[in-house]
């Protein structure tokens, strides 16, 4: 259970500056790159650069803008209705079921297996086997790969392995 | 075990209300945002809205803000969907969701969550 996700609370920041652009809320949310304000009358404007949103809301607090860790570079910067978008440097991959770091990508396939992919950002180098054409990904499935329903085909009722 | 039980699906007219429930078996529930998507037939899924971890602010999906609310009781382990002003457009397969890790704030794409509810139809007849 304690492995399943452990949420941050929003960094504590300033009530908007005077400055920044307010509107009304359209039934009770206001639009991407707002928030509300406390008293549900004004939407106020996203911070560039420093936070965003990014679907109508009524969020207090603009969300955070992600900082790319070393060794990810940023593809895109933060704007006020996107978050910065963070890719693995060259050489290294950050698998969809394992985001919290870059790993380095193989540089060679076992013997008797030839690479037929090559090392992305996303994915590691593709090797199968010279006589099957077989997949070897060169890696034991992590156990939340093993059981985590796809969208397309959830259990009845869902009942994963956490 | 991660298990959530969806409940509160039906057949409903078009105008009419309907509130979906999400009953989650995990502890960890009450520091984890929680998501609501849908699936039309033929169509992919998509997201309808998403509640911050501690139930104060969301995302709602254009097609639906004004008319759906995202609530969660973290004291019982439940997130609710109320869907006021239904439209026939709204017909679909609902489902509830938890993030498969904590890299995101408020996810609002289906890559980022792990963990699905079993679904519960949803049927707006005009």
């Known amino acids: 259970e304690s492995a399943l996700i452990t949420q941050q609370d929003l960094a504590p920041q300033q009530r908007a500056a005077p400055q920044q652009k307010r509107s009304s809320p359209s039934e009770g949310l206001c639009p991407p790159g707002h928030h509300i304000s406390e008293d549900g009358r004004d939407c106020i404007s996203c911070k560039y650069g420093q936070d965003y949103s990014t679907h109508w809301n009524d969020l207090l607090f603009c969300l955070r803008c992600t900082r790319c860790d070393s060794g990810e570079v940023e593809l895109s910067p933060c704007t006020t209705t996107r978050n910065t978008v963070c890719q693995c440097e060259e050489g290294t991959f950050r698998e969809e079921d394992s985001p919290e770091m870059c790993r380095k990508c193989r540089t060679g396939c076992p013997r008797g297996m030839v690479k037929v992919g090559d090392c992305t950002p996303w994915s590691d180098i593709e090797c199968v086997h010279k006589e099957s054409g077989t997949k070897h990904s060169g890696e034991v499935p992590a156990v939340e790969e093993t059981v985590t329903s796809s969208p397309g085909t959830p259990a009845s009722p869902c009942s994963l392995s956490g | 075990q991660v298990q959530l039980v969806q409940s509160g699906g039906g057949l409903v007219q078009a105008g009419g209300s309907l509130t979906l429930s999400c009953a989650a078996s995990?502890?960890?529930?009450?520091?984890?945002?929680v998501g609501w998507f849908r699936q039309a037939p033929g169509k992919e899924r998509e997201f309808v809205s998403a509640?911050?971890?501690?139930?104060?602010?969301?995302y709602y999906a254009d097609s639906v803000r004004g008319r759906f609310k995202n609530s969660k009781d973290n004291a019982k382990r439940t997130a609710y969907l109320q869907m006021n002003r239904l439209k026939p457009e709204d017909t679909a397969v609902y489902y509830c969701?938890?993030?498969?890790?904590?890299?995101?704030?408020?996810?609002?794409?289906?890559?980022?969550?792990?963990?699905w509810g079993q679904g519960t139809q949803v049927t707006v007849s005009s």
């Open positions: 969701a938890l993030p498969r890790r904590g890299d995101s704030e408020l996810p609002s794409t289906v890559k980022e969550y792990g963990y």
């Open positions: 995990v502890s960890t529930f009450g520091t984890s945002p």
């Open positions: 509640i911050r971890w501690d139930g104060v602010g969301a």
